[in-house]
Interface confidence: low
C-alpha cells in the first residue's frame, strides 16, 4: 500500500518531519534508513531504521487525586523490517506501572453558617438586585474541601422610581463610496457617513438628555491610487536535477510573475511560484555498520594453569562484538572488535556475605494484568577478598586494573528463614486500565 514518506524521524516526540510526498511504497521510502513513513495522515510514524524501543513516555496522571493510587507509562517498538529486543513486532506497546500519591489526605466538605442580612438595593431607580452572604465555617472544610452551594444569593428589588433614559449615538454608518476608485477623475470625490440618536433615544418623562454632537460628517477622498494592473504568470522554467544520489529526492520547477508585472497595487499572481516532483534514483543509500552489544566475558583463566578460582592469581579474559548492518558501501564500525582485561576468578568461591539494606520498591507487576503487586528485597551480598587492585606489567607498560569475575557463593546468617534473598510484597492500589494512546486520539 502507498505511504506518506518523510525525510526525518524525531526520536523525542516520535513524529515524522519534512514531508517528501505520498504515493510511494514503504520499500522505496525506506531505501534511505534515515527516512520515516506514515500509513495515513496523522497516523503512527515509523522510522525506516531497524526497530528499537522508543523512549518511555512521561508517567500518566495518578489514577486518584488523593491517597495512594497507580500510574502508567509506555514505550513503543518503532522501526521497519525487523523486531525489537524480546522478538517484539514494530508498533507493539510495552507498559510500566508504579504507585503514586498526589495528596496524602482526601478533601472533606464543610458546612455553611446562617445567612447574613440583605444588603441595600443595587440601584436608586427602577429595578435592581440585593444580595446576602454566608460563611463556610460551620464546620470549616478540611484538606482542600469546600462547602456545597453558593456563598451568596441575590433577589430582585424594586425602588418604585422611574429612571430617565439619556440619548446615546448608535454606531456610525458606513462611508458612502467615493465617486471614483482611481485618481485623476473629473470631480473631487467625497464620502459621507451618518448616525442616529437611537442607542437609546432620550426619554420624554422623566426627560432624558439628547445626544451630543453632529448626526453626520463628510470628508474629501484622499490618496486614491492609480488604477491597478493585475500580475500574470510567465512560463514554467526547466526541471531542476535530482539533488540526491540515492533513495528519493525532490526536484523543482519555477515561474515568475512578470507576464505582466503587477502595477499600482494590482493583485500578485494567484497560485504557487514553484512546484515539486519526487525523483527516484532507485539506488539504495549506504548504511553504516553498528556494533552489537559486547558479548559475555570469557572465563577468567591463566595459561598453563588448570584453575585459578578462589586464589590470589590474576588471569585474563576477553569478550567480542559483531559489526552488523553495513550495506551498500557504508562505513565499517570504528573501534576494537575484541576487549581483553585482567581478572581474579571468584567463580563458585564460598565467600562471607552480609545482608544489604532493603531495595527501593519495584514497579507494579504485571502492569496490565490482574492484581498487580510491587516488591522489595534484601540480598546476601558477598564480601570480596582484599586482593591487589592492580598488577604490574613488563617494563614500560605500567600498571593494569584487575577485576573480580565469576558468581561466588555468599554465606550469610539466616534471615527470616532465608539464606540468599528476603522479599516483601505489597498490592498496588487503584490500578488504571492500559489503553493504547493512539486509540484514545481517534
Amino acid at each position: 500500500d502507498p505511504v506518506l514518506c518523510f525525510t526525518q524521524y524525531e526520536e523525542s516526540s516520535g513524529k515524522c518531519k519534512g514531508l517528501l510526498g505520498g504515493g510511494v511504497s514503504v520499500e522505496d521510502c525506506c531505501l534511505n534508513t534515515a527516512f520515516a513513513y506514515q500509513k495515513r495522515s496523522g497516523g503512527l510514524c515509523q522510522p525506516c531504521r531497524s526497530p528499537r524501543w522508543s523512549l518511555w513516555s512521561t508517567w500518566a496522571p495518578c489514577s486518584v487525586t488523593c491517597s495512594e493510587g497507580s500510574q502508567l507509562r509506555y514505550r513503543r517498538c518503532v522501526g521497519w523490517n525487523g523486531q525489537c529486543s524480546g522478538k517484539v513486532a514494530p508498533g507493539t506497546l510495552e507498559w510500566q506501572l508504579q504507585a503514586c500519591e498526589d495528596q496524602q489526605c482526601c478533601p472533606e466538605m464543610g458546612g455553611w453558617s446562617g445567612w447574613g442580612p440583605w444588603e441595600p438595593c443595587s440601584v436608586t431607580c427602577s429595578k435592581g438586585t440585593r444580595t446576602r452572604r454566608r460563611a463556610c465555617n460551620h464546620p470549616a472544610p478540611k484538606c482542600g474541601g469546600h462547602c456545597p452551594g453558593q456563598a451568596q444569593e441575590s433577589e430582585a428589588c424594586d425602588t418604585q422610581q422611574v429612571c430617565p433614559t439619556h440619548g446615546a449615538w448608535a454606531t456610525w454608518g458606513p462611508w458612502t463610496p467615493c465617486s471614483a476608485s482611481c485618481h485623476g477623475g473629473p470631480h473631487e470625490p467625497k464620502e459621507t457617513r451618518s448616525r442616529k440618536c437611537s442607542a437609546p433615544e432620550p426619554s420624554q418623562k422623566p426627560p432624558g438628555k439628547p445626544c451630543p454632537g453632529l448626526a453626520y460628517e463628510q470628508r474629501r477622498c484622499t490618496g486614491l491610487p492609480p488604477c491597478p494592473v493585475a500580475g500574470g504568470w510567465g512560463p514554467w522554467g526547466p526541471v531542476s536535477p535530482c539533488p540526491v544520489t540515492c533513495g528519493l529526492g525532490q526536484t523543482m520547477e519555477q515561474r515568475t510573475c512578470n507576464h505582466p508585472v503587477p502595477q499600482h497595487g494590482g493583485p500578485f499572481c494567484a497560485g504557487d511560484a514553484t512546484r515539486t516532483h519526487i525523483c527516484n534514483t532507485a539506488v539504495p543509500c549506504p548504511v553504516d555498520g553498528e556494533w552489537d552489544s559486547w558479548g559475555e566475558w570469557s572465563p577468567c583463566i591463566r595459561r598453563n594453569m588448570k584453575s585459578i578460582s578462589c586464589q590470589e592469581i590474576p588471569g585474563q579474559q576477553s569478550r567480542g562484538r559483531t559489526c552488523r548492518g553495513r550495506k551498500f558501501d557504508g562505513h565499517r564500525c570504528a573501534g576494537q572488535q575484541q576487549d581483553i582485561r585482567h581478572c581474579y576468578s571468584i567463580q563458585h568461591c564460598p565467600l562471607k556475605g552480609s545482608w544489604s539494606e532493603w531495595s527501593t520498591w519495584g514497579l507494579c507487576m504485571p502492569p496490565c494484568g490482574p492484581n498487580p503487586t510491587r516488591a522489595r528485597q534484601r540480598l546476601c551480598t558477598p564480601l570480596l577478598p582484599k586482593y591487589p587492585p592492580t598488577v604490574s606489567m613488563v617494563e614500560g607498560q605500567g600498571e593494569k586494573n584487575v577485576t573480580f569475575w565469576g558468581r561466588p557463593l555468599p554465606r550469610c546468617e539466616e534471615l527470616q528463614g532465608q539464606k540468599l534473598v528476603v522479599e516483601e510484597k505489597r498490592p498496588c492500589l487503584h490500578v488504571p486500565a492500559c489503553k493504547d494512546p493512539e486509540e484514545e486520539e481517534l
Epitope: 524480546g86 507493539t92 496490565c368 494484568g369 492500559c434 486509540e439
Partner: nanobody, 119 residues
C-alpha cells in the same frame, strides 16, 4: 509460555467468505492483545486486525468493513470473520498474542494457516 493453534484456512472464490479461528492455551491470564497478521509471498508481514483485552479493535484500511475480529474469553479463542474476499487477500494468516510479564512484553505466534482466494 502461550501456545496458539490456527484453523479455518483454505481455498475460496473471490466474493466468498471464510472464518479463521485461533485457540490459545498456557499462561493466557496475562494476554492483553490478540491479533491476526498476514504475509503474502515476497512481502512484509502486516497487521490485519487486533482486539484488546477490553474489546477495542483496530483494522487495516484494506479490510475495513469486510473483516470482523472477535474474542471468546470463556473458550480462549479469537475469530476472524472474512467476507467479500478478494484475490489480494491471499496470504498465510498468523495468530498473534501479546503478553505482559514481570520483565516486559512477549510476542507469541501460531504456525499460520493458508488462505487462497481465486478469481
Amino acid at each position: 509460555e502461550v501456545q496458539l493453534v490456527e484453523s479455518g484456512g483454505g481455498l475460496v472464490q473471490a466474493g466468498g467468505s471464510l472464518r479463521l479461528s485461533c485457540a490459545a492455551s498456557g499462561r493466557i491470564s496475562s494476554i492483553i492483545h490478540m491479533a491476526w497478521y498476514r504475509q503474502a509471498p515476497g512481502k512484509q508481514r502486516e497487521l490485519v486486525a487486533e482486539i484488546s483485552r477490553v474489546g477495542t479493535t483496530v483494522y487495516a484500511d484494506s479490510v475495513k468493513g469486510r473483516f470482523t475480529i472477535s474474542r471468546d474469553d470463556a473458550k480462549n479463542t479469537v475469530t476472524l470473520q472474512m467476507n467479500s474476499l478478494k484475490p489480494e487477500d491471499t496470504a498465510v494468516y498468523y495468530c498473534n498474542a501479546l503478553q505482559y510479564e514481570k520483565h516486559g512484553g512477549a510476542d507469541y505466534w501460531g504456525q499460520g494457516t493458508q488462505v487462497t482466494v481465486s478469481s
